[in-house]
Interface confidence: medium
């Protein structure tokens, strides 16, 4: 008779995680009589998966009755497959001995396990940035197999191109992870914007997984400041307003200074939202002109979202306000719109007029 051959007809088998796998193996001869063993991997470190004669293999059963003398089918059935079961399985014929003597191995069947990627998790920058700056968003998904996967980034439905993606590990593994970092340039209108990370994989049957992040968590829109004087009131009081506009987030503290001395401090709260997601706030200060001999320098000082304070000053000319009622008013606006577009070190603006 011809020399025994061990035939594993399938070079590869692909199974979804949780399903069962059948690994086929037949021998061409009953001789020599001796057990079949199944191993995952080859060489000295190979892992015993099933022994026809010994051991307890709760997830593995032989397809046919391998104790039968005439049996030539040594296929096995592995239940409840997980990604950890992936690998190349070898059906190996042994001749009885102490220990049994390996006679011949099959060519191997590669078992690949199709495992779904986890829901993508998108994380944004640790600190907020202002418009025109570039921020990075990271998307991570884990536990998928096979390795081939597609990841796309979108901002408000528009596909992004500035991103880098890595799938790890580079070599063979039971399952893989993907990590992608996208660079997004912020604009003032991005408070309501969203970035989406979309992952497509063979296990998802064309229905990709998505992870999202709101740019509202990453953006800071610094306020515009404008200080104006309202019409002179009858009781020698000047109403000065500080309009703080188009800022985000809402966290803002406003301080009025009269000639450098703190007059009042207020915290913004429960402000109505603009269409673009920003906020406006107006603060009033009543200045009693008759109480002052000299001109009064009013400063509206705004500290937004923990950033260095921004000042806007306004001079009320006391000399232009005779003590009698109905006199003309004159005021000098000495402030400028100061925006913190610059880096932190450049944000301290203190104008003294």
């Amino acid at each position: 008779e011809e020399e025994l051959q061990v035939i594993q007809p399938e070079k590869s088998v692909s199974v979804a995680a949780g399903d069962s796998a059948t690994l086929n193996c037949t021998v061409t001869s009953l001789i020599p009589v001796g057990p079949i063993q199944w191993f995952r991997g080859a060489g000295p470190g190979r892992e015993l998966i099933y022994h026809q004669k010994e051991g307890h293999f709760p997830r593995v059963t032989s397809v046919s009755e391998s104790t039968k003398r005439n049996n030539m089918d040594f296929s096995i059935h592995i239940s409840n497959i997980t990604p950890a079961d992936a690998g190349t399985y070898y059906c190996v014929k042994f001749r009885k001995g102490s220990p049994d003597v390996e006679v011949k191995s099959g060519a191997g069947t590669e078992l690949s396990v199709r495992a779904k990627p986890s829901a993508p998790v998108v994380s944004g920058p640790a600190v907020r940035a202002t418009a025109e700056h570039t921020v990075s968003f990271t998307c991570e998904s884990h536990g998928f197999s096979p390795r081939d996967i597609t990841l796309k980034w979108f901002k408000n439905g528009n596909e992004l191109s500035d991103f880098q993606t890595n799938v790890d590990p580079a070599g063979k593994s039971v399952s893989y992870s993907i990590r992608s970092t996208a660079r997004v340039v912020l604009t003032r209108r991005d408070v309501h914007s969203q970035v989406i990370c979309e992952v497509a994989h063979v296990t998802l049957q064309g229905d990709p997984l998505r992870g999202t992040a709101n740019l509202s968590e990453a953006i800071r829109v610094p306020p515009f400041l404008e200080v104006t004087q309202q019409s002179m009131r009858a009781d020698n009081q000047v109403n000065v307003t500080c309009q703080v506009t188009k800022f985000y987030p809402q966290r803002l503290q406003l301080t009025w200074l009269e000639n450098g001395n703190v007059s009042r401090t207020e915290m913004a709260s429960a402000l109505p939202e603009n269409k673009d997601g920003t906020y406006n706030w107006t603060s009033w200060l009543l200045v009693n002109v008759s109480a002052h001999r000299d001109d009064v320098k009013l400063t509206c000082q705004v500290e937004h979202d923990g950033q260095p304070a921004v000042n806007k000053s306004f001079s009320v000319k006391v000399s232009a306000h005779p003590k009698e009622q109905g006199s003309n008013t004159a005021a000098e606006n000495t402030g400028t719109n100061e925006r913190d577009y610059k880096d932190d070190d450049d944000k301290h603006h203190h104008h003294h007029h």
């Epitope: 008779e1 011809e2 020399e3 025994l4 001869s29 001789i31 020599p32 009589v33 001796g34 057990p35 026809q52 004669k53 010994e54 051991g55 307890h56 009755e65 104790t67 039968k68 003398r69 042994f94 001749r95 009885k96 049994d100």
Partner: antibody, heavy 119, light 110 residues
Framework: QVQLVQSGAEVKKPGASVKVSCKAS????????INWVRQAPGQGLEWIAM????????HYNQIFKDRATLTTDTSTSTAYMELRSLRSDDTAVYYC????????????WGRGTLVTVSS | DIVLTQSPDSLAVSLGERATINCRAS??????????IFWYQQKPGQPPKLLIY???NLDSGVPDRFSGSGSGTDFTLTISSLQAEDVAVYYC????????FGQGTKLEIK
């Protein structure tokens, strides 16, 4: 390690039956054939029969086919050999032996059970 | 059924000398290079012990002074240098069909 522990000696009258047990340990009982072999005093080895505990498939020596019955209890990993219609020439040591590699050979042996048939 | 005939029935060999026991099958028990002959050693009061399987393969723990050879119908068990503990009865067995044993060969020291 593989161990086959057999029941104790029996004395039987002609025409009676005897049931010898063989308790296996140290391996997966249902994965190996169990053989039964006897040896009359001062005589050679005589194969009686074999059983596959996984499904109770049996093969008998034609000489014993009508009188011997092999059974197993997989819950206790025990094999049994019953011999009926005993005669004086059935006096022998009865061995159970395990076939490791489906070679129809006997790799591991019990210590034997002496069955004496005497009137 | 296959009949196995051992020769001689008994054998006396001096310590350190070679002992040879033969086993002839009534039909071939060989195929594709594998020979379905097994050799057992039985000492008084003990069960048999497998020495050699598939005609020429030493079972684990068996001293290498024991060897088996042969093919087809004629097989030989050889002890290259007899030791005192080798005194026993030796049996051949075939498994080409259902098992049968040879009648045994008693080995003694001369």
């Amino acid at each position: 390690q593989v161990q086959l522990v057999q029941s104790g000696a029996e004395v039987k009258k002609p025409g009676a039956s005897v049931k010898v047990s063989c308790k296996a340990s140290g391996y997966t009982f249902t994965n190996y054939w169990i053989n039964w072999v006897r040896q009359a005093p001062g005589q050679g080895l005589e194969w009686i029969a074999m059983i596959d505990p996984s499904d109770s498939e049996t093969h008998y020596n034609q000489i014993f086919k009508d009188r011997a019955t092999l059974t197993t209890d997989t819950s206790t990993s025990t094999a049994y050999m019953e011999l009926r219609s005993l005669r004086s020439d059935d006096t022998a040591v009865y061995y159970c032996a395990m076939d490791y590699g489906s070679l129809y050979a006997m790799d591991y042996w019990g210590r034997g059970t002496l069955v004496t048939v005497s009137s | 059924d296959i009949v196995l005939t051992q020769s001689p029935d008994s054998l006396a060999v001096s310590l350190g000398e070679r002992a040879t026991i033969n086993c002839r099958a009534s039909k071939s028990v060989s195929s594709s290079g594998y020979n379905y002959i097994f050799w057992y050693q039985q000492k008084p009061g003990q069960p048999p012990k497998l020495l050699i399987y598939l005609a020429s393969n030493l079972d684990s723990g068996v001293p290498d002074r024991f060897s088996g050879s042969g093919s087809g119908t004629d097989f030989t068990l050889t002890i290259s240098s007899l030791q005192a503990e080798d005194v026993a009865v030796y049996y051949c067995q075939e498994s080409w069909e259902l098992p049968t044993f040879g009648q045994g060969t008693k080995l003694e020291i001369k």
